[in-house]
């Protein structure tokens, strides 16, 4: 059993049938010694008597909220959760795999820029009863500060039957250099509550391997004199770190037909122009990536032909 | 304002080039291991991220561009005394700091050079013959070198008597790789930085 | 193997023009990007213009742009390069290159992995 915080405990317990369980000792925090009775959540039934009250916890109708009182008057109060262990793994029962980049992906992060600042977001079905906390760090061993908002419910999708919740969660590094190499990656750790069961959630990541810059400003289309042709423009994100001669990001242009069938012509570009035969009815797309290391393209930035 | 292309103009930074192929060496030759050592651990989340020239050189401070030396997580108070002269100062107006910042670069290099000479005599060795170190990317570490030109010691490769563990050296290999990239990553930008300037 | 064969190219006075080709053979090159890229004696060779492999996104050096245009013939598999109003700085040999869209950005040389021979172009004056 462990502290999660003030009056909320944690029982860690192997999940299986006829499992024995985990025996805890709960202490009323009160000076008092004499006339002490127990009982769990809103029920009147008197559980035992004393400052101490020792219980078997093996499922969750033993776990819950467990009150001293004297003389009708409560003394204090112990939150009793459960963290299910099964066949030697933590139980993930509150989030959903979002399967990408791989298999176990629970949390997602991504940074716009190299500054210290990302989100991390996670799904669930749950729709009540549920409470997250989210601490991160850089490195482990020694860590050094990275402070989180609190999370907040930030979608709502209908998947079929299943409503799907998103939750996200902004975190800024307390000192970040974005020139910096970094060595130490980054930890996020979720606390996740439904109910009565805790469970938790980590991810481990360097900041430049979850940036994914806005898409590029402005893009716009220019007519060339005499010529089918345009002058494509566009410009930086405003989010994405400077200077911009340092922090350099590569192009993706994209020229779409009107249907989705015709094949698109694309190219790769250093530049924040390009010239395009301009045909009726196509689109044409822009995307950014950091030029000197892979990680994700930005979404595109569309302008129609016409 | 646009960066110029890859390719040299006349006038243009001459290391920009040497910069870029070396990025392109390194990450191909990172791929290359990640594929040939799948049963090693060899990817990001695995190794141990080690950087062999920390407390020798310092080429992130030392080539901070301008905007970022307002940013006190920036400055670190580490000094160290570098060579002031080499061929991709492009004018006599260079600062001491770019010059500082070239020459930790070279050192950069020259120590990682070794390192990869040494650890592919070990490769070479290796009954296996699983993975050695591409030709280009140790070519591209000298060209650049020779871009720089700097006038150094030459670093003594170095010879180790005992019978090499070749599951360490590839492991080595993986890390030494890794902490390249990263590297080549800040030389490219500075160089970009540089040739913008 | 994609082999690039040049054509066209001369001598002209300045302000004249000149069209360039270049024709593939071995592959279909509708699916490659490709350039033309310039070479001076005693100089590195440098980037003129690139064009996408369905010919509808191009780019050019500063230096060309307004003069120079570059198009392609995918039924042909020949690239063209016109180039109008000639000056002096002009004068090198021009070499076609052709490249998978994917290999890197379309400007520069390193994106390119099949090359032609190239064709001289003197501007005099």
């Known amino acids: 059993i462990w502290e999660l915080k003030k009056d909320v405990y944690v029982v860690e317990l192997d999940w299986y049938p006829d499992a024995p369980g985990e025996m805890v000792v709960l202490t009323c925090d009160t000076p008092e010694e004499d006339g002490i009775t127990w009982t769990l959540d809103q029920s009147s039934e008197v559980l035992g008597s004393g400052k101490t009250l020792t219980i078997q916890v093996k499922e969750f109708g033993d776990a819950g909220q467990y009150t001293c009182h004297k003389g009708g008057e409560v003394l204090s109060h112990s939150l009793l959760l459960l963290h299910k262990k099964e066949d030697g793994i933590w139980s993930t029962d509150i989030l959903k795999d979002q399967k990408e980049p791989k298999n176990k992906t629970f949390l997602r992060c991504e940074a716009k820029n190299y500054s210290g600042r990302f989100t991390c977001w996670w799904l669930t079905t749950i729709s009540t009863d549920l409470t997250f906390s989210v601490k991160s760090s850089r490195g482990s061993s020694d860590p050094q500060g990275v402070t989180c908002g609190a999370a907040t419910l930030s979608a709502e999708r209908v998947r079929g039957d299943n409503k799907e919740y998103e939750y996200s969660v902004e975190c800024q590094e307390d000192s970040a250099c974005p020139a910096a190499e970094e060595s130490l990656p980054i930890e996020v750790m979720v606390d996740a509550v439904h109910k009565l069961k805790y469970e938790n959630y980590t991810s481990s990541f360097f900041i430049r391997d979850i940036i994914k810059p806005d898409p590029p400003k402005n893009l716009q289309l220019k007519p060339l004199k005499n010529s089918r042709q345009v002058e494509v423009s566009w410009e930086y994100p405003d989010t994405w770190s400077t200077p911009h001669s340092y922090f350099s990001l590569t192009f993706c242009v994209q020229v779409q037909g009107k249907s989705k069938r015709e094949k698109k012509d694309r190219v790769f570009t250093d530049k924040t122009s390009a010239t395009v035969i301009c045909r009726k009815n196509a689109s044409i797309s822009v995307r950014a990536q950091d030029r000197y290391y892979s990680s994700s393209w930005s979404e595109w930035a569309s302008v129609p032909c016409s | 304002r646009n960066l110029p292309v890859a390719t040299p103009d006349p006038g243009m930074f001459p290391c920009l080039h040497h910069s870029q192929n070396l990025l392109r060496a390194v990450s191909n030759m990172l791929q290359k291991a990640r594929q040939t050592l799948e049963f090693y651990p060899c990817t990001s989340e695995e190794i141990d991220h080690e950087d062999i020239t920390k407390d020798k050189t310092s080429t992130v401070e030392a080539c901070l561009p301008l905007e970022l030396t307002k940013n006190e997580s920036c400055l670190n108070s580490r000094e160290t005394s570098f060579i002031t002269n080499g061929s991709c100062l492009a004018s006599r107006k260079t600062s001491f700091m770019m010059a500082l910042c070239l020459s930790s670069i070279y050192e950069d290099l020259k120590m990682y050079q070794v390192e990869f000479k040494t650890m592919n005599a070990k490769l070479l060795m290796d009954p296996k013959r699983q993975i050695f170190l591409d030709q280009n990317m140790l070519a591209v570490i000298d060209e650049l070198m020779q871009a720089l030109n700097f006038n150094s010691e030459t670093v003594p490769q170095k010879s180790s008597l005992e019978e090499p563990d070749f599951y360490k050296t590839k492991i080595k290999l993986c890390i030494l790789l890794h902490a390249f990239r990263i590297r080549a990553v800040t030389i490219d930008r500075v160089m970009s930085y540089l040739n913008a300037s | 193997e994609v082999q690039l064969v040049e054509s066209g190219g001369g001598s002209v006075q300045v302000g004249g023009f000149l069209r360039l080709s270049c024709v593939g053979s071995?592959?279909?090159?509708?699916?490659?990007?490709m350039g033309w890229f310039r070479q001076a004696p005693g100089k590195e060779r440098e980037f003129v213009a690139a064009?996408?492999?369905?010919?509808?996104?191009?780019d050019y050096r500063d230096s060309v742009k307004g003069r120079f245009t570059i198009s392609r013939d995918n039924a042909r598999n020949t690239m063209y390069l016109q180039m109008n109003s000639l000056k002096p700085e002009d004068t090198a040999v021009y070499h076609c290159?052709?490249?998978?869209?994917?290999?890197?950005?379309?400007?520069?040389?390193?994106?390119?992995?099949?090359w032609g021979q190239g064709t001289q172009v003197t501007v005099s004056s």
């Open positions: 064009i996408s492999g369905k010919g509808l996104i191009s």
């Open positions: 290159a052709a490249g998978q869209w994917s290999a890197g950005p379309f400007t520069r040389e390193r994106s390119y992995e099949y």
């Open positions: 071995g592959r279909t090159l509708n699916m490659y990007n």
